[in-house]
Interface confidence: low
């Protein structure tokens, strides 16, 4: 293959591969906990936004989808499922009332919502 | 790697790979002809929509972008750059104004526009 071309992955079958990360958009609506469980069952996690450059395909996404960002009431911080803290300036956080979970929306926006509301969701698997 | 996982591609560096097709979304606005030339310079073509199943990631795309569909005034048909005819029921064609080129918009819609209007565009490369 040409030097300018390369393979991406590995990813679960029929997932999107971009800059060696794997993504899948799930159409069925689930609450945050069910969405998390669905991703885990596929050896993945809910979307983690860690880089506007590496994840610039997320600019293009329409609608709203659960991602892996949750509010930790004890210290007021926002953290990802893996325990890492949300980096500053990565997401514009839009706080809807009484919510501890976040919906990803186009152009790096995070809508804070009630975790029990059903929504579509994005799973992500980082390749080594 | 697990049997359920696979590599995707090969694709140009940093393109999106999905079901062994390569896609890239270009942010700069060009007219249809310039967009076509840009894709060709990268050994690709403007987006060809050939399957709702294999290309279901296109449901998620926001905004609108030039694709490789053009109107052939002599016989009134719509065809792709490779000369193949647009299959029925693949795209909902919406005539915005008099034009011979088509913009792809979310959920398999094609908006007919004047080819000289600048727009963002999608390049695609089919892997063997």
């Amino acid at each position: 293959i040409p030097l300018t071309e390369s393979y991406c992955g590995p990813c679960p079958k029929n997932w999107i591969c971009y800059k060696n990360n794997c993504y899948q958009f799930f159409n069925e609506s689930k609450n945050w906990y069910e969405s998390q469980a669905s991703c885990m069952s596929q050896n993945a996690s809910l979307l983690k936004v860690y880089s506007k450059e590496d994840q610039d395909l997320l600019k293009l996404v329409k609608s709203y989808h659960w991602m892996g960002l949750v509010h930790i009431p004890t210290n007021g911080s926002w953290q990802w499922e893996d325990g890492s803290i949300l980096s500053p300036n990565l997401l514009t956080i839009i706080e809807m009332q009484k919510g501890d979970c976040a919906l990803y929306a186009s152009s790096f926006k995070g809508y804070i919502e009630n975790c029990s509301i059903p929504n579509t969701y994005i799973c992500m698997q980082r390749t080594v | 790697i697990p049997l359920t996982e696979s590599y995707c591609g090969p694709c140009p560096k940093n393109w999106i790979c999905y079901k062994n097709n390569c896609y890239q979304f270009f942010n700069e606005s060009k007219n249809w002809y310039e967009s076509q030339a840009s894709c060709m310079s990268q050994n690709a073509s403007l987006l060809k929509v050939y399957s709702k199943e294999d290309q279901d990631l296109l449901k998620l795309v926001k905004s609108y972008h030039w694709m490789g569909l053009v109107h052939i005034p002599t016989n009134g048909s719509w065809q792709w750059e490779d000369g193949s005819i647009l299959s029925p029921n693949l795209l909902t064609i919406i005539e915005m104004q008099k034009g011979d080129c088509a913009l792809y918009a979310s959920s398999f819609k094609g908006y007919i526009e004047n080819c000289s209007i600048p727009n963002t565009y999608i390049c695609m490369q089919r892997t063997v």
Epitope: K62, G99, S107, K109, E113, N119 | K62, S63, I94, S107
Partner: antibody, heavy 125, light 107 residues
Framework: QVQLVQSGAEVKKPGASVKVSCKAS????????MHWVRQAPGQGLEWMGI????????SYAQKFQGRVTMTRDTSTSTVYMELSSLRSEDTAVYYC??????????????????WGKGTTVTVSS | EIVLTQSPATLSLSPGERATLSCRAS??????LAWYQQKPGQAPRLLIY???NRATGIPARFSGSGSGTDFTLTISSLEPEDFAVYYC?????????FGGGTKVEIK
């Protein structure tokens, strides 16, 4: 086609409350967030808040916290904006506006793609 | 919150002339800026989104440019129906805010 139909003009006394309705049609009501924006006579546009018609969650501009309540009724595809403790400076036209969510030609997120015609609220003793 | 300052407050021009409206943000809003047109007694109408993209049905004489803190709306040749008030709005930072408006009036 997509439409937002607002309730009629209101005249209220200072200290009273007003509840403005906005009935949506022509699209899936629960799929789009709804904003409320007001405009005092001869003045510019002022964002008041947003509601998610799906779950009913809201976010209000700091200025209106404690005085504004946004609700929705999914059975009638209607959102409501109630403003309490009215004062003369609340005299304005109140608009509901759908947040464009990328489903329509040329629409992008976070911009108000469809607006109601506005409801005039006059606060006068 | 981000403050959007529009200038000039009023622009007096004749039909056929070119109109250039400015919107300056107190901090960067990337390209997440929209322009609306409002005529007397009417609701605002979306013209431009993402700084430079025309919304549905908006004539080609309207164009937007800029990124970061400085944005411009240009009407290449004013038509009689273009005399109105124009507002910019940013959606990069919460809460979303509007500029104070520019009135384009007939000279």
């Amino acid at each position: 086609q997509v439409q937002l139909v607002q309730s009629g003009a209101e005249v209220k006394k200072p200290g009273a409350s007003v509840k403005v309705s906005c009935k949506a049609s022509g699209y899936t009501f629960t799929s789009y967030y709804m904003h409320w924006v007001r405009q005092a006579p001869g003045q510019g546009l002022e964002w008041m808040g947003i509601i998610n018609p799906s779950g009913g969650s809201t976010s209000y501009a700091q200025k209106f916290q404690g005085r504004v309540t946004m609700t929705r009724d999914t059975s009638t595809s209607t959102v409501y904006m109630e403003l309490s403790s009215l004062r003369s400076e609340d005299t304005a036209v109140y608009y509901c506006a759908r947040e464009g969510a990328g489903f329509a030609y040329g629409m992008d997120y976070y911009y108000m793609d469809v607006w109601g015609k506005g409801t005039t609220v006059t606060v006068s003793s | 919150e981000i403050v959007l300052t529009q200038s000039p407050a009023t622009l007096s021009l004749s039909p056929g002339e070119r109109a250039t409206l400015s919107c300056r943000a107190s901090q960067s809003v990337s390209s997440y800026l929209a322009w609306y047109q409002q005529k007397p007694g009417q609701a605002p109408r979306l013209l431009i989104y993402d700084a430079s993209n025309r919304a549905t049905g908006i004539p080609a004489r309207f164009s937007g440019s800029g990124s970061g803190t400085d944005f411009t709306l240009t009407i290449s040749s004013l038509e009689p129906e273009d005399f109105a008030v124009y507002y910019c709005q940013q959606s990069d930072n919460w809460p979303f805010t509007f500029g104070g408006g520019t009135k384009v009036e007939i000279k």
